[in-house]
Interface confidence: low
């Protein structure tokens, strides 16, 4: 992988038609910020600016709208929004930031309301969306930022909203909240400091008695020449219900660490981007993936990981030694005094002592950090988004895989195989103006990933098992998602019947899986072609045999008959061999890709001239053949030009 | 569906060596999602943890055992083994080997008889 | 070091709730699991993380805690309920697994 990261094995430029994709836009809209499936996985609900969508994205192809409302902001507060000298072009309006299902009946949605955020239920019939009333639009302060470009999180648990944003106009008041349901509003207390002013929340994920907050702030815990910013996971436990006397309508539970990003002797990726839960059948085997910046361009590029973080290690360093302020210094060292009881955090059920609340008002943050395991550092790309599900290979075996999208409109699709680094299966340029992807959806149902831009929402197929025409390229290919189906002879996704299916996630080694035909009958370390592409020569014409470079992990060379080519002596123009008819100029020339320890050929040529034609090698004998038209340079004569020609007699 | 077997010679010699093997099948013992781990149960009494393997082969095992105890895995096997040397009587028990963090599933247990 | 109480016996006639506890200092901030063993067989999991159920276990099992108190509730007893009952969680000083004594369950 080198010091870049994994590469993309394969790489689609945007308007590729080798990758099935489908766009949806709709005149009018931008900022398809907020996406929700439906809970039957049939429906996308998108918040836009100053819109709710319902999409039906039932059928492959182009996800269709089924209906959609209008939320705007008021015209007194784009009015008033303007006069605070905020832009009515690109500030002063309704974005949805948050987007949830409140129950069978019922979304709620939240948006920035021209700074002024704003809260509503939102009421569904047969999965449409039925109109807001101006009535019911509640205070939305603390639910959704004020402004559109400041981060944000909120998650539904129990009929509770959790919510991290900003919680003023200005931008430097950051809060984490509960609201909604039958137990008492809480937030985070200003004037305690347990939140830096610049905090950045960017997920939310609940857990069997808390409700963990990811973000980044400034750190105050360490002397540093430079402002150094800190990833942090923070906890609140569900059942608090705030202090009687201290701390009404606080949270009592509130506890912050530092989340660890970093392989081993070098700086840290210490900006947090976007965080996910991938549940395991217990939830403390359970991991939180997450994707990580760095406020240091090593390189003068930027560089991204991903790092996981089991649920288990959070839990231990939020059980764990508590820093605390000194005073006189302030400096933060590891608390050594006497525990109290309940222990801040523990989400003990009983009303908590004063001395307890006292206790827990200064000592918020942890002493150790939690270490995640880099499963993925790539330099030259920044991600800002991540999905990610287990995908069951052919044997059974689980792996993770990863949708991670980039601040240049792209997406990769990375697979962790058990206990190793993560390698890239495909990128993906969907947006041909590269500008960012805001959101990703994975909608498991259709076997899909969507993702949000200012102008439209993508459908990705999560795999592109067809565009792997051989099964050697299939097998190299690594993706979980497909395997090679011998009968068919076809790249498949893979489905419930797919016994003698080939597949190979733990090697990715076509030597053990495609061996079939020739190979059964002796095992070389090189395929036989699939098809022989006939080529004549012409007279007085340079011959360019064309070399498609399927993957970017193979190295290629080009040989004639048995004998390697060498480069030295070999006119390669962007991976074509360039030849000029003459004596021995005939026979088999192949194109050969090496990945993976194995060689196999892309493409086969037999050039044979008009008046010397070359018997074909038995050894080939059965091998399909058809007769192409290649690129020809016509030399001699003074004159030089490059044409298609047709060399076949009509 | 992850399924558990113990296997091992289900008679020892006080002072030998006890070997049982447990055979995963169905999961991965490479996993890193999980530790495997060996647990005991005298005839009439209740669980006793002895250790726990994790997927990086770092072990971890009960303080009242460690000095007679070694569990190892065999990644390409898909197999965890369980040896307990200098064993006495008191090493009589029904002997499991379970997934965890929760211990869920159990292996059916194979009784191993510490007598000369 | 942790430890575990639980009474060794709990009697409960056929449809009524038993209620098997477990006490340990500070339980109620610690993920507790409960297992069932029946006679010859080896133990199976009922309630992990304190009151969360894996799939195949009824929903009459359910696990609560209070501060220094777990509790495996069995409602509307059954008598293939008949069983020992372990609880168990992990210490949270030395990362490693506690088992109480267990308590056995008779269905009259």
């Known amino acids: 992988t080198g010091g870049q990261g994994p590469m993309p094995r394969v790489k689609y430029h945007a308007g590729d038609g080798h990758r099935a994709l489908s766009f949806f836009q709709q005149k009018g809209l931008r900022d398809f910020d907020t996406l929700l499936l439906s809970d039957d996985g049939n429906t996308l609900y998108v918040g836009a600016r100053e819109a709710v969508l319902a999409l039906n994205i039932q059928n492959p192809g182009i996800p269709r709208l089924k209906n959609m409302i209008p939320w705007p902001a008021s015209e007194r507060k784009k009015t008033e929004c303007a006069f605070k000298k905020k832009s009515n072009e690109t500030q002063c309006f309704n974005f949805i930031r948050v987007l949830v299902s409140y129950n069978a009946t019922h979304l709620y949605a939240c948006g920035t309301f021209a700074f002024s955020p704003a809260c509503t239920f939102i009421e569904l019939q047969d999965s449409l969306l039925l109109p807001i009333l101006i009535d019911k639009v509640m205070d939305g302060k603390g639910q959704s930022p004020f402004d559109p470009v400041h981060k944000h999180t909120a998650v539904l648990v129990d009929g509770m909203l959790y919510s991290g944003t900003m919680n003023n106009f200005l931008g430097s008041e950051p809060i984490l909240m509960r609201t909604l349901g039958s137990q008492p509003v809480l937030k985070t207390d200003i004037f305690l400091r347990w939140l830096h002013a610049d905090a950045s929340f960017v997920a939310a994920i609940p857990s069997t008695q808390v409700v963990y907050f990811f973000f980044e702030e400034t750190a105050s815990e360490f002397d540093f020449f430079e402002e150094l910013y800190i990833s942090r996971v923070a906890q609140v436990c569900k059942n608090d219900v705030g202090g009687e006397k201290l701390l009404q309508k606080k949270w009592t539970t509130f506890l912050k660490a530092q989340l660890l990003c970093a392989q081993p002797g070098q700086l840290p990726f210490n900006i947090i981007r976007h965080a996910v839960l991938l549940p395991a059948d217990s939830p403390s085997v359970s991991r939180i993936y997450a994707v990580f910046t760095s406020q240091w361009q090593v390189g003068g590029t930027r560089s991204s990981a991903v790092c996981a973080f089991s649920l288990t290690d959070i839990e231990r360093v939020f059980k764990g030694k508590y820093k605390e302020l000194n005073k006189e210094t302030s400096r933060w060292t590891t608390y050594r005094g006497s525990e109290v009881s309940p222990r801040p955090g523990s989400c003990s059920m009983g009303p908590s002592s004063d001395k307890a609340l006292t206790f827990m008002k200064d000592h918020f943050l942890m002493d150790e950090h939690v270490v995640g395991t880099p499963l993925l550092v790539k330099s030259g790309v920044e991600y800002t988004r991540l999905a990610v599900e287990s995908a069951r290979g052919l044997d059974g075996s689980s792996h993770v895989v990863m949708y991670l999208g980039t601040s240049t409109g792209s997406l990769h699709k990375a697979v962790v195989p058990q206990d190793s680094s993560a390698y890239l299966v495909e990128e993906i340029q969907l947006s041909p103006d590269s500008e960012p992807v805001r959101n990703l959806q994975l909608a498991p149902a259709q076997g899909a990933v969507f993702a949000g831009f200012s102008g439209g929402i993508w459908r990705v197929p999560r795999a592109n098992c067809s565009v792997y025409e051989s099964c050697v390229d299939c097998v190299l290919a690594r993706d979980p998602h497909c395997a090679w189906d011998p009968e068919s002879r076809l790249c498949s996704l893979l489905s419930g019947s797919t016994k003698p299916w080939k597949q190979d996630m733990e090697r990715g080694n076509p030597e053990w899986v495609c061996t079939r035909g020739p190979m059964a009958r002796s095992p070389r370390r090189q395929s036989p072609p699939q098809l022989i592409k006939e080529v004549l020569t012409v007279p007085n014409s340079i011959l360019e045999l064309p070399c498609p470079h399927l993957s970017a992990l193979a190295s290629y060379h080009w040989s004639h008959g048995r004998a390697k080519i060498s480069e030295a002596s070999a006119t390669v123009y962007n991976g074509s061999l360039l030849l000029l008819p003459q004596d021995g100029v005939g026979g088999l020339y192949q194109c050969v890709a090496t990945e993976n320890g194995y060689s196999y050929p892309v493409v086969s040529y037999w050039v044979d001239s008009q008046d010397q034609p070359l018997a074909l090698d038995p050894e080939l004998a059965g091998v399909p053949r058809e007769r192409v038209q290649v690129p020809l340079t016509r030399v001699g004569g003074g004159a030089s030009m490059a044409a298609q020609r047709s060399y076949w007699p009509h | 569906q992850v399924q558990l077997q113990e296997s091992g010679p289900g008679l020892v010699k006080p002072s030998e060596t006890l070997s049982l093997t447990c055979t995963v099948s169905?999961?991965?013992?490479?996993?890193?999602?999980?530790?495997w781990s060996w647990i005991r149960q005298p005839p009439g009494k209740g669980l006793e943890w002895i250790g726990h393997?994790?997927?990086?082969?770092?072990?971890d095992y009960n303080p009242s055992l460690r000095s007679r105890v070694t569990i190892s895995a065999d990644k390409p096997k898909n197999q965890f083994s369980l040896k307990l040397n200098s064993v006495t009587a008191a090493d009589t028990a029904v002997y499991y080997c379970?997934?965890?963090?929760?211990?869920?599933?159990w292996g059916q247990g194979t009784m191993v008889t510490v007598s000369s | 070091q942790s430890v575990l109480t639980q009474p060794p016996s709990v009697s409960v006639a056929p449809g009524q709730t038993a209620s098997l506890t477990c006490g340990a200092n500070?339980?109620?901030?610690?993920?507790v699991q409960w297992y069932q063993q029946k006679p010859g067989q080896a133990p199976v999991l009922v309630v992990y993380?304190?009151?969360d159920r894996p799939s195949g276990i009824p929903d009459r099992f359910s696990g609560s805690s209070s501060e220094n108190t777990a509790t495996l509730t069995i409602s509307r007893v059954e008598a293939g309920d008949e069983a020992d009952y372990y609880c168990?969680?992990?210490?949270?000083?030395?990362?490693?697994?506690?088992f109480g004594g267990g308590t056995k369950v008779t269905v009259l």
């Open positions: 379970a997934r965890g963090p929760f211990f869920d599933p």
């Open positions: 393997i994790y997927y990086t082969g770092i072990t």
């Open positions: 500070n339980i109620g901030s610690k993920s």
């Open positions: 993380d304190g009151s």
């Open positions: 168990q969680l992990w210490d949270s000083v030395t990362d490693r697994p506690v």
């Open positions: 169905g999961g991965s013992v490479s996993s890193g999602r999980y530790d």
